[in-house]
């Protein structure tokens, strides 16, 4: 009798734990990637940023993959995506080529199955960074809730990459899964 | 037979409910703190803001602690942290000491065990608030996903605190737990 | 014996699944609404934006309702709310009547039971958009964690609606439920 109960309870608890693990504790995917400033492209045109840290300082990743400058989704779901991009210039870095700047970020999703790239979120500002001030700074924050499928890739494009702030607290992006797709 | 089933089911359901409570229903920690403008420091240097409401209007807290101007983590986990900081100036408040301003926010984490403070997120902008306009306004938003341990403290530092907008919809910060640490 | 075990396990698993469904899998409410630019009001005063998409492109909704320009809460809970609002102007769109602009967003909550409307979050900036530049752009992002009751309504107000960027990646707002109310 008691042996039967124990065996059955173990079996039932096992399925319970398995279900609970799948439904909640199973390490919901997330990523927080911080800029790797050793390889920031120069220029003022829109470029895709491919160098990010995923395992040092505040950077971390779980149940997602970082490859070739893109954050790859491994698990279908609804995710909250966010990005914080800081631009800065000090006169000691040299004169700006133009005082009128477009400082922009674009968070894009690429689907490999149907080769296409779409902008999920954009933000930024046009700025007049005059020579009258020795230091200039500007930050952009964007965030939103999106359905992502396994294999889809998230990447970050910015204008004027040479002006990016290389600090890990300044220029980063990330995602975390909030819920399953029904 | 039926009694045996009921007893066992109660036992199994009990562990289920206990697990479910721990895993989801157990009041995941959160906080949304709004600025307490009665005690905003003056000056233009970077200062830590210590006066926040936690229990009036939109402000609320659960399974976290607010003490000495810091939001204290009570439960290990991955949290989404955010801050919205608004600065404003009207000519009726008097002339600005300088028209060139750095309006910045820094979200910092302090570990008591290993006494150290680190900036998790920063944002802001340099601004030229000329006397040609009678009113100036600027808001910063930052957000990100971070691993926090019990006992760690989150605080907010800003430049030019005397320019802060004191409304609860303007200047606030918060956190909510998204998932456990594996 | 084995039949008894199967019957009981089915019964226990059934209650488990029911609980799990209620506690986690029960389709947590969310919405991501993108601007419908076919009906943006003109003018420079603060207006409520009533035209949003909820079922095309990135726009989606589940267990919430969109009606009369408002996002209606169907399920009590704590929600993370966010908005991204982009303003832009190109000289081909007409000449600016003033270079001094207040570009603002207000995320408001309306309670029908106690007829009242309150601003949960605000953000924006005063801008000087001079005729010397052919293109101007500025984005605002706000986000925060709020207790919402069934029947409450979320809406978006902006200044200078005629300057809104009509792209779905530019001007949007949303919400997702994070946890139940204790």
């Amino acid at each position: 009798g008691s042996q039967h109960i124990r065996a059955e309870k173990a079996m039932v608890d096992g399925s319970w734990l398995d279900l609970a693990k799948r439904s909640k504790l199973e390490a919901q995917p997330f990523a927080h990637l911080t800029i790797n400033a050793t390889d920031i492209p120069s220029g003022s045109h829109k470029v895709s940023l491919s160098s990010w840290y995923h395992d040092r300082g505040w950077a971390k990743i779980s149940n997602m993959t970082f490859s070739n400058g893109k954050l790859i989704v491994n698990q279908d779901g609804f995710y909250y995506l966010y990005a914080n991009i800081c631009f800065r210039h000090h006169e000691t870095s040299g004169d700006l080529a133009t005082e009128y700047l477009q400082l922009m970020v674009y968070v894009t999703k690429t689907s490999i199955k149907i080769p296409s790239s779409h902008t999920l979120m954009k933000g930024g500002s046009t700025k007049y960074w005059s020579g009258n001030s020795e230091f200039h700074f500007y930050s952009i924050n964007v965030g939103g809730f999106f359905k992502l499928r396994s294999g889809e890739e998230i990447s970050i494009e910015v204008s004027n990459p040479s002006l990016l702030d290389p600090d890990q607290d300044a220029t980063y992006f990330g995602a975390f899964k909030v819920r399953d797709i029904d | 037979g039926s009694q045996h089933i009921r007893a066992e089911k109660a036992m199994v359901d009990g562990s289920w409910l206990d697990l479910a409570k721990r895993s989801k229903l157990e009041a995941q920690p959160f906080a949304h703190l709004t600025i307490n403008a009665t005690d905003i420091p003056s000056g233009s240097h970077k200062v830590s803001l210590s006066s926040w409401y936690h229990d009036r209007g939109w402000a609320k807290i659960s399974n976290m602690t607010f003490s000495n101007g810091k939001l204290i983590v009570n439960q290990d986990g991955f949290y989404y942290l955010y801050a919205n900081i608004c600065f404003r100036h009207h000519e009726t408040s008097g002339d600005l000491a300088t028209e060139y301003l750095q309006l910045m926010v820094y979200v910092t984490k302090t570990s008591i065990k290993i006494p150290s403070s680190h900036t998790l997120m920063k944002g802001g902008s340099t601004k030229y608030w000329s006397g040609n306009s009678e009113f100036h306004f600027y808001s910063i938003n930052v957000g990100g996903f971070f691993k926090l341990r019990s006992g760690e403290e989150i605080s907010i530092e800003v430049s030019n605190p005397s320019l802060l907008d004191p409304d609860q919809d303007a200047t606030y910060f918060g956190a909510f737990k998204v998932r456990d640490i594996d | 014996g084995s039949q008894h075990i199967r019957a009981e396990k089915a019964m226990v698993d059934g209650s488990w699944l029911d609980l799990a469904k209620r506690s986690k899998l029960e389709a947590q409410p969310f919405a991501h609404l993108t601007i419908n630019a076919t009906d943006i009001p003109s003018g420079s005063h603060k207006v409520s934006l009533s035209s949003w998409y909820h079922d095309r492109g990135w726009a989606k909704i589940s267990n919430m309702t969109f009606s009369n320009g408002k996002l209606i809460v169907n399920q009590d809970g704590f929600y993370y709310l966010y908005a991204n609002i982009c303003f832009r102007h190109h000289e081909t769109s007409g000449d600016l009547a003033t270079e001094y602009l207040q570009l603002m967003v207000y995320v408001t909550k309306t309670s029908i039971k106690i007829p009242s409307s309150h601003t949960l979050m605000k953000g924006g900036s005063t801008k000087y958009w001079s005729g010397n530049s052919e293109f101007h752009f500025y984005s605002i992002n706000v986000g925060g964690f709020f207790k919402l009751r069934s029947g409450e309504e979320i809406s978006i107000e902006v200044s200078n609606p005629s300057l809104l960027d009509p792209d779905q990646d530019a001007t949007y707002f949303g919400a997702f439920k994070v946890r139940d109310i204790d």
């Epitope: - | - | 081909t92 000449d95 005729g131």
Partner: antibody, heavy 122, light 108 residues
Framework: EVQLLESGGGLVQPGGSLRLSCAAS????????MSWVRQAPGKGLEWVSG????????YYADSVKGRFTISRDNSKNTLYLQMNSLRAEDTAVYYC???????????????WGQGTLVTVSS | EIVLTQSPGTLSLSPGERATLSCRAS???????LAWYQQKPGQAPRLLIY???SRATGIPDRFSGSGSGTDFTLTISRLEPEDFAVFYC?????????FGQGTKVEIK
């Protein structure tokens, strides 16, 4: 009551210059964008130039760009149009008109002054 | 620039009749950004309608505007003797602001 009164028109030779003025009253002048619109004899209306309330930004039709300059003196509630290198095709009645101030983009014109005639002829 | 073409060039009607004036744009006008003016001989233009369909202050309700995109209409439901004049449409959806060439409404 909003009133706009133009002056400074007259006969001028091709290549010559003229300065038109528009005296405004009945509203907070510095808060509104202003424009000049012209109408050649027996013809339709043509927008010429506009200026923001602060005077910080100015706009011109391609047909007058580089030759005409719009300005304002908010302390005197007066709008100006400096016209240089005048041509025969600039002959018209010149109206000053107020922007409504309810939109961030310059929009319709309301009200208009009574106009001043500029004749460019040798 | 956007070219506005008004039709007909001249409309001959009697008092009490309905007048329908057309304004067609060479490309779609962004938003409701179209206005109508009335000009009588020797006078400055007077604003009648703005934002396609909003009547200006003091304008009688017999004047109404409609349309969107490239096709806009000014309707005078019942002509009064003082209504006979030249009518101009004007767009302000893009720069530069432009006017139509005018429609003359004359007494038949």
């Amino acid at each position: 009551e909003v009133q706009l009164l133009e002056s400074g028109g007259g006969l001028v030779q091709p290549g010559g210059s003229l300065r038109l003025s528009c005296a405004a009253s009945g509203f907070t002048f510095s808060s509104y964008a202003m424009s000049w619109v012209r109408q050649a004899p027996g013809k339709g209306l043509e927008w010429v130039s506009g200026i923001t309330g602060s005077g910080g930004s100015t706009y011109y039709a391609d047909s007058v760009k580089g030759r005409f300059t719009i300005s304002r003196d908010n302390s005197k509630n007066t709008l100006y149009l400096q016209m240089n290198s005048l041509r025969a095709e600039d002959t018209a009645v010149y109206y000053c008109a107020k922007d409504p101030g309810t939109t961030v983009i310059m929009s319709w014109f309301d009200p208009w002054g009574q106009g001043t005639l500029v004749t460019v002829s040798s | 620039e956007i070219v506005l073409t008004q039709s007909p060039g001249t409309l001959s009607l009697s008092p009490g009749e309905r007048a329908t004036l057309s304004c067609r744009a060479s490309q779609a006008i962004r938003g409701p950004n179209l206005a109508w003016y009335q000009q009588k001989p020797g006078q400055a233009p007077r604003l009648l309608i703005y934002d396609t369909s909003s009547r200006a202050t003091g304008i009688p309700d017999r004047f109404s505007g409609s349309g969107s995109g490239t096709d806009f209409t000014l309707t005078i439901s019942r002509l009064e003797p003082e209504d006979f004049a030249v009518f101009y449409c004007q767009q302000y959806g893009s720069s530069p602001r432009t006017f139509g060439q005018g429609t003359k409404v004359e007494i038949k």
